[in-house]
Structure formats: structure tokens, C-alpha cells
């Protein structure tokens, strides 16, 4: 039942917790059969997704999958937010689910939240400690 539809393997509710100042590669896993589609990244601003025109991107080709990579060198605090990749293939536009980057500013990370803060703002625990796996290749 192998289909030749282009697939973008970004899962709904996927997240990455990253540190400002570090390099980071945001991967869009792409499956295609013959001709590689044109893939772009955009960043969500409300309901619109703003295309990232002048950012460094690259392709990494593996046996059964390719990765369109958005490079963060380094990660900046305002890189926090949700991103989506899109593929143009035979005049069809295929959009991925959004993936969210939670950027922790190194300065604020060193000033660790107190236990009281953690108790009153449980989402802090989530953002600081809920690190999702990167894709295994």
C-alpha cells in the first residue's frame, strides 16, 4: 500500500525545549518518490504563517527519508513559537502540523524559579523539564 503522495512527518503537538545561545536544527522529515518537492518553513503569527525567506536552510538525504532543516545559529529568545513546513508538489500544497519551540533564555534559566513559583505556575515545570526526543535517524 505504498503511496507516492508527499508526506511531512511532523506530529501534532510536537515540541522542542531549547536554550537561547545554542545552535539548533529544526527538521521537517519529507517522504517523496521521484522529484523532490519545494519545501519552505514559516512561523505562526496568530492564524497566519509568515514565510521565513532569509533563513539558512539545508537538505539532508537519507535512504528512505529526507530532512528539510531550518538552522538556528544560535537560537535567540524571539525564536520561541510555532513553526510549520510546507511542500509544493505538482501544484499541490501540503502543510505539516505545527511544531513548537520553547526557548529558555540562558540568563533567566540560571535564575531558577523557586518552589513557590513552580507550585503557582505548573507550566514552568512542563517547559523546563518536558524535553521531547529529537527524531532518531
Amino acid at each position: 500500500k505504498e503511496s507516492c503522495d508527499v508526506q511531512l512527518y511532523i506530529k501534532r503537538q510536537s515540541e522542542h525545549s531549547i536554550l537561547a545561545g545554542d545552535p539548533f536544527e529544526l527538521e521537517c522529515p519529507v517522504k517523496y518518490c521521484a522529484n523532490r518537492p519545494h519545501v519552505t518553513w514559516c512561523k505562526l503569527n496568530g492564524t497566519t504563517c509568515v514565510k521565513l525567506e532569509d533563513r539558512q536552510t539545508s537538505w539532508k538525504e537519507e535512504k528512505n527519508i529526507s530532512f528539510f532543516i531550518l538552522h538556528f545559529e544560535p537560537v535567540l529568545p524571539n525564536d520561541n513559537g510555532s513553526y510549520r513546513c510546507s511542500a509544493n508538489f505538482q501544484s499541490n500544497l501540503i502543510e505539516s502540523h505545527s511544531t513548537t519551540l520553547y526557548v529558555t533564555d540562558v540568563k533567566s534559566a540560571s535564575e531558577r524559579p523557586s518552589k513557590d513559583e513552580m507550585a503557582s505556575r505548573p507550566w514552568l515545570l512542563y517547559r523546563h523539564h518536558h524535553h521531547h526526543h529529537h527524531h532518531h535517524h
Epitope: R12, S14, I94, H135
Partner: antibody, heavy 121, light 112 residues
Amino acid sequence: QITLKESGPTLVKPTQTLTLTCTFSGFSLSTFGMGVSWIRQPPGKALEWLAHIYWDDDKRFNPSLKSRLTITKDTSKNQVVLTMTNMDPVDTATYYCAHGNWDGETYFDYWGQGTLVTVSS
Amino acid sequence: DVVMTQSPLSLPVTLGQPASISCKSTQSLLDSDGKTYLNWLQQRPGQSPRSLIYLVSKLDSGVPDRFSGSGSGTDFTLKISRVEAEDVGVYYCWQGTHFPWTFGQGTKVEIK
């Protein structure tokens, strides 16, 4: 050809932990897009999705049962294991594992035969 | 959670005649990626479920083309153009747009 088969106890006592194994063939759970879900069906009732594990070991749970569930995979053995703690008679159901295919998101294209689990003292 | 409501719950049909099942959701199933993750399953008596249709209208492999799916947003329909004896069973719609994934209560198709 994709096949899945559930195995585990047919009878568990209230408060005990249920461990079910899904053994599959015809696909690899390390391939992008692949996943396995557990779904249950109480006798004569509708289906209820419990948990899903993705190709990269990412997991999703039904929030109503999340505190009681764990799901793990062993790619080398082609197995997915579901554990459910603190079993209650209302958890009596046929438990299915299903292959999650991907077309922008998961859908279940192959199902196991199911295993009936009765919770009774 | 998104509640999926099917109607009718019981559908007596005549062999060779068409049949139609409705499925309604409490939230739109149109995802932000532009796709609608509404699927249909068939469960024959004493068997495990089988995938019929995914993404509203895509027939899964091996499914006869007398089955078709349609709809958008919150209203969806499964149609059987000419019912055959092997179509007897319970049909479920389910949604994969919102977590947790949820199923309808099922529609039992039986021959008159």
C-alpha cells in the same frame, strides 16, 4: 502483509495491573509515519482510544486514563506493551492494538483480533 | 473531548438498495494543515474493526467502491450504493483531528 496480535491475561482482579503485549509483523516501528495504538471495546459498547506510540517513541494518551497508562515499544522484538494500573470491573473490555498509518496524521488501517479482559474478584 | 454522534443507531436495509449513515462532531474536524481527519470503520459480527475510509473520502485498500464517504467541518456521511450480505455489521466514524481521538457510538446495519 501487516498483522497484529494481542496477548495477556484474560482475567484480572480489581486493583491489579494489566499488562498487554501487541506483537506485530509486516512493518517496522522505527519507520517514519508508523505507530501503534491501543483501543478498547466494552461488551456491546463503542470503541475507546487509549494510547498511541509513534515511530520516534513519542507517546499520546487519552487524558481520562493517562494517570493509569504506560505504553512502550521494543522495535527489535516488534512489540508494543500497554500497562494499565488499578483495574476496575468497568475496565472489562476487548482490548485491540491497531497499526497507525500516516497520511498527514495517523489512521488505523490494520487491527489485531483483540483480547477479552475481564476484571472480577 | 470531541463527541461523535452517529445516526441512525440501527439501519435495516434491503439487499441491493442504498444505505446512508450520518456522523456529526461537536467541533470542526478541519485541521490547521488543511486536512480533515474523519475516518470510518466496519466491524462485522464477531470480528475486529476494519478500516474503510480515511480523510473523509479516501477508500482504504481492498475496500469495494460501493462504499463512499463525504462531508466537511462537522457533518459527514458514509454511503453504500448497493448493500450486499457481507456489509452487515457495525459502522463507526472516528476523528483524528483533536486529541483524544474519539469514536462514534456505532450504527448497526442489518438486512431486513
